[in-house]
């Protein structure tokens, strides 16, 4: 069974998938469509790297642009380095500026919904 066939079989169960499962899926050429990606748990999507999301979505990655202001895409973009987002060539905006340090302050983030940044 190839990645696409596997994806079709598990598609309806993906809404509650944890980060680890999404990371594993990204290695299987599943080419997840944006409609499915948008239904994923935000907390499961946030830890994914740009490379992992690119692999997970395959050719559908360009659809991130159209959804960049919708969750979970918006929140995921806020967690990525702008330099990494730029490698996709989609014109995605809102990533962490080059030279900034991300502090993983759980309480700060829980309150504000965004990571705490320290300038260069």
């Amino acid at each position: 069974m190839n990645g696409s066939e596997y994806f079709v079989k598990i598609q309806s169960f993906l809404g509650g998938a944890p980060t680890e499962d999404l990371k594993a899926l990204s290695q299987q050429n599943v080419s997840m469509d944006l409609a499915t990606f948008m239904k994923l748990r935000t907390d499961a999507v946030l830890p994914l790297t740009v490379a992992e999301v690119q692999k997970l979505l395959g050719p559908h990655v360009e659809g991130l642009k159209a959804e960049e202001r919708h969750r979970p895409v918006r929140d995921w973009i806020l967690r990525q380095r702008q330099d990494d987002l730029d490698t996709l060539g989609l014109g995605l905006q809102g990533g962490i500026p080059n030279g900034y340090l991300v502090l993983d302050l759980s309480m700060q983030e829980a309150l504000s919904g965004t990571p705490c940044l320290l300038g260069p």
């Epitope: 469509d33 948008m38 642009k65 159209a66």
Partner: antibody, heavy 119, light 108 residues
């Protein structure tokens, strides 16, 4: 056949609110965002915002922020656009338009709803 | 926001003639994020071209689109009477999404 059927024409007084509905049929409702675009008499097209029917997430054009609210009813495959604090400049034809999630173009449009704001 | 300026505003053309409509953006637009719509009198707009040059389903091949950066073009190669309409360009490269002011094409 894919169809978007909108509610009928409305006449409202300045300061009032209007709620326009858009019923979708012939496709998987949650695979497409629904956008709203308006057109004042003799004028061009103006994008108002969109709603993701799957999550209920909305994005609004800042020009309408605070005045526009988009909602959905998945069980009825219907989306709604409510515009409050109406003024004469809001007189226009309001269109719902389907946009596949992950794209930015509108491949199916409703027939339009004429909203007239007049005292 | 990105302002899309179309020219001409109005064009009166004889059948079989070639029509060229330009859409100039105030800032660069990624070509994948530009589309064209056709709106006939008293009708809803209809998708004509997406991603700058891709014809929407059912659109005749006499329509074509091209361009990049800030300059985009819609061409109707051999105008037919049914092409009388107003044409709009549209970008979703930058928020908020915007449309051009429209170009009305009339048949002589």
């Amino acid at each position: 056949e894919v169809q978007l059927v909108q509610s009928g024409a409305e006449v409202k007084k300045p300061g009032a609110s209007v709620k326009v509905s858009c019923k979708a049929s012939g496709y998987t409702f949650t695979d497409y965002n629904m956008d709203w675009v308006r057109q004042a008499p003799g004028q061009g097209l103006e994008w108002m915002g969109d709603i993701n029917p799957s999550t209920g997430g909305t994005i609004y054009n800042q020009k309408f922020s605070g005045r526009v609210t988009m909602t959905e009813d998945k069980s009825a495959s219907t989306v709604y656009m409510e515009l409050s604090s109406l003024r004469s400049e809001d007189t226009a034809v309001y269109y719902c338009a389907r946009r596949r999630i992950g794209t930015g173009y509108f491949d199916v449009w409703g027939q339009g709803t004429t909203v007239t704001v007049s005292s | 926001e990105i302002v899309l300026t179309q020219s001409p505003d109005f064009q009166s053309v004889t059948p079989k003639e070639k029509v060229t409509i330009t859409c100039s953006a105030s800032s660069s637009v990624i070509s994948s994020y530009l589309s064209w719509y056709q709106q006939k009198p008293d009708q809803s707009p209809k998708l004509l071209i997406y991603r700058t040059s891709n014809l929407a389903s059912g659109v005749p091949s006499r329509f074509s689109g091209s361009g990049s950066g800030t300059d985009y073009t819609l061409t109707i190669n051999s105008l037919e009477a049914e092409d009388a309409a107003t044409y709009y360009c549209h970008q979703w490269s930058s928020f908020p999404y915007t449309f051009g002011g429209g170009t009305k094409v009339e048949i002589k």
